[in-house]
């Protein structure tokens, strides 16, 4: 019997300072690009290695991003979302969305490869 | 994971035109940035011009600006690079690339390692 995967959601304001190659990571959505079903919220798809969110080390590859320096991102095209970023200035604040996964197996159940002791 | 294929390369006389094709697989292409970069030979492989995938914003290398442009066919998971007023100096292996996303940094500090997939790339050769 498999387990029930579930979600734990916590929010995090991470500030970044760009560097000269920038923020150093991508995103996807927008209302006008849907990356998660009926959800237009906007989400982090790469971070460059090296780069500003790298270094700092908090963002992660799938995070949502709330908001950017305080100015929402609900209800954003993408293209005025990446422009938002990129004209956001030196020092960068953003609220963000981690959503780790957290697998529950039933109870009193060990798997395979759980230690015995 | 995307497959790319460039196609459209050749000689042309210097101040000609060439319209390079990059065909991509996969279901989600309007998700990627697409560009594309030249290499000559010795030299290291530059960026020429990217194009985002939902509203389309482009961005280009200074020697190129007002001589190439790039677009793209959501419809058809093809973006071009139409190159008019050839120069010498743009002979090069010209390769196709996508990444996942729109990068949040602006196009004047793009390198190769800002794209994860390529193509085999297409020769240009202009005399």
């Known amino acids: 019997m498999n387990g029930r995967v579930d979600y734990l959601v916590t929010e995090e304001e991470i500030n970044l300072t760009r560097g000269p190659s920038g923020l150093g990571f991508n995103i996807v959505g927008g209302t006008d690009q849907q990356y998660v079903s009926n959800d237009s919220g906007i989400y982090v798809s790469r971070i460059k290695e090296n780069g500003a969110a790298a270094l700092d080390g908090r963002l992660q590859e799938g995070d949502k991003i709330l908001s950017v320096n305080g100015q929402d991102l609900k209800n954003l095209l993408h293209q005025d979302a990446v422009d938002l970023f990129r004209n956001a200035g030196y020092a960068v604040s953003l609220r963000v969305q981690h959503r780790l996964q957290v697998q529950n197996g039933p109870i009193g159940h060990r798997g395979e490869g759980d230690p015995s002791g | 994971q995307v497959q790319l294929v460039e196609s459209g390369g050749g000689l042309v006389q210097a101040g000609g035109s060439l319209r390079l094709s990059c065909s991509a697989s996969g279901r989600t292409f309007s998700s990627y940035t697409m560009g594309w970069f030249h290499q000559a030979p010795k030299k290291e492989r530059e960026f020429v011009a990217e194009?985002?995938?939902?509203?389309?914003?482009?961005g280009y290398t200074d020697s190129v600006k007002g001589r190439f442009t790039i677009s793209r066919d959501n419809a058809k998971n093809t973006v071009y690079l139409q190159m008019n007023s050839l120069k010498p100096e743009d002979t090069a292996v010209y390769y196709c690339?996508?990444?996942?996303?729109?990068?949040?940094?602006?196009?004047?500090?793009?390198?190769?390692?800002?794209?994860?997939?390529w193509g085999q790339g297409t020769q240009v050769t202009v005399s």
């Open positions: 690339a996508a990444v996942i996303g729109s990068p949040t940094d602006s196009s004047d500090y793009r390198s190769s390692l800002d794209f994860d997939y």
């Open positions: 194009i985002g995938g939902t509203g389309g914003g482009t």
